[in-house]
Interface confidence: medium
């Protein structure tokens, strides 16, 4: 028998083993956030599954993806948002260490999916283990790229009080107008319900003092924010090791100074 | 001019209700978070409530939980603290105040105070 | 401690330089900015420092704001008799999700 013709991608593949990591990975959420233990975790993957299985990979919709994201509806209290763009490791290690405050890779539907790939093909109940559509050499409707748009819009709108951002200041456009920041979550913060938005720009040089809080890209974001009529903050953080050693040793003297 | 003017204080019986308001003018009332902060007589100050300035967010002191509800009118440029089960700790001039655009918490209009006295 | 600790009362004579300070914990002071206001008697408070250190428009320079760690502080140079007036600190607990003044310093000018 001759193996049926599977369309050709440019990106990689779906991650091995991917129902098997989803299904893991939702266990071990909801055995470790009690808020949580309702959810059932085979019903989410029946949600995941139904997104983009039989379905062209270019075609996918927020609305594809509605069903998971009522099952994984969360809550975070106010003051406690962090956003992030081009510095994931580093707003992953601050969440670790100050656990009241949460990435939407903290959230059960960021962590269900964080790192992985997947994509089905039309009409067919296989997943595609071999390519799946890249977001520029394919199409931006794909599967992974719709499902970070509709979970990150989610984590935006549902956001209140001081909403913080990490971005990285090794960039030549610390804010990026084209990333899921700049594209999605900024215009989805809600000023009825977020008092203000406080960037917090990470160097990357030890020895970059320059204030990069008046970054041309920074003053870009500054003005998109107020135009929405939420109060914006920027606040550099020089010593990025620092930062991290002083969330985890409060009281040690050195963090009385700057970071 | 930026005016915040409270009414409504008054002589109340333990247990009684009151509804406190504060009138704004001379800023986009809409577009600003507001608070309630009280003083009893010769104590020091002591914040009650704030509302988000679309009213969907709201934040209470541990001492007025479950008694006190703060709410807003953008449509008349009014802020509201309704005041139930009222008690003689309660006893106070009760200030409005908006918040600066300028930080998070900082409160730099404030009226000129109502009085509230509970008192058999 | 969940609410900041301010001295009850400061004095000083014009033209001195007082300080006041506002000892805090690492859920409010340290982790949030800090605020003072100003108040005389029978009036209402007036914003004197927000952010720490910033003055808004029409607060005279001699008054400023510092802080350092878990503590803060209010120094008023060259004082004068207009200054006299209870002065109260005020940040965000986090821990509290809740606003939190100092229980304010009366400043007597002698």
């Known amino acids: 028998v001759l193996p049926r013709w599977r369309q050709q991608w440019s990106g990689s593949g779906t991650t091995s083993r991917f129902p098997e990591t989803v299904l893991a990975r939702c266990v071990k959420y909801t055995e470790v956030h009690p808020e949580m233990r309702h959810v059932d975790c085979q019903s989410v993957w029946d949600a995941f599954k139904g997104a983009f299985i039989s379905k062209y990979p270019c075609n996918i919709t927020e609305e594809d993806y509605q069903p998971l994201v009522k099952l994984g509806t969360q809550t975070v209290p106010c003051n406690k948002t962090l956003l992030w763009s081009r510095i994931k490791d580093l707003a992953h290690q601050f969440t670790q260490v100050q656990r009241d405050m949460f990435t939407l890779e903290d959230m059960l539907l960021g962590y269900l999916a964080d790192d992985l790939t997947w994509c089905g093909e039309f009409n067919t109940f296989e997943i595609n283990y071999q390519s799946c559509p890249d977001w520029r050499k394919d199409c931006s409707n794909n599967p992974v790229s719709v499902f970070w748009k509709t979970v990150s819009r989610r984590f935006a709108e549902t956001a209140c009080g001081v909403v913080h951002v990490m971005l990285n200041g090794s960039r030549s456009k610390i804010f990026d107008k084209n990333s899921t920041f700049g594209s999605v979550e900024v215009h989805n913060l809600q000023p009825e319900k977020v008092q203000a938005l406080e960037a917090w720009v990470i160097h990357g040089g030890r020895e970059d003092s320059r204030d990069l809080c008046q970054d041309p890209t920074i003053k870009e974001l500054e003005s998109i924010i107020s135009k929405r009529n939420i109060r914006f903050f920027c606040k550099n953080i020089y010593r990025p090791d620092k930062f991290l050693q002083c969330v985890k040793n409060p009281e040690d003297s050195s963090c009385l100074s700057g970071i | 001019e930026v005016q915040l003017l409270e009414s409504g204080g008054g002589l109340v019986q333990p247990g009684g209700s009151l509804r406190l308001s504060c009138a704004a003018s001379g800023f986009d009332f809409s577009s600003y978070w507001m608070n309630w902060v009280r003083q009893a007589p010769g104590k020091g100050l002591e914040w009650v409530s704030t509302?988000?300035?679309?009213?969907?967010?709201?934040y209470y002191a541990d001492s007025v939980k479950g008694q006190f509800t703060i709410s807003r009118d953008n449509s008349k440029n009014t802020l509201y603290l309704q005041m139930n089960s009222l008690r003689a700790e309660d006893t106070a001039v009760y200030y409005c105040a908006k918040d600066n655009w300028n930080d998070y918490y900082g409160m730099d209009v404030w009226g000129q105070g109502t009085t509230v006295t509970v008192s058999s | 401690q969940s609410v900041p600790t301010q001295p009850p009362s400061a004095s000083g004579t014009p033209g001195q330089r007082v300080t006041i300070s506002c000892s805090g914990s690492s859920s409010n002071i340290r982790d949030n900015y800090v605020y003072w206001y100003q108040q005389v008697p029978g009036t209402a408070p007036k914003l004197l420092i927000y952010?720490?250190?910033q003055r808004p428009s029409g607060v005279p320079d001699r008054f400023s704001g510092s802080k350092s760690g878990t503590s803060a502080s209010l120094a008023i140079s060259g004082l004068q008799s207009e200054d006299e007036a209870d002065y109260y600190c005020a940040t965000w607990d986090g821990s509290l999700n809740a606003r939190v003044f100092g229980g304010g310093t009366k400043l007597t000018v002698l």
């Open positions: 952010k720490d250190d």
């Open positions: 509302i988000s300035s679309g009213g969907s967010i709201i």
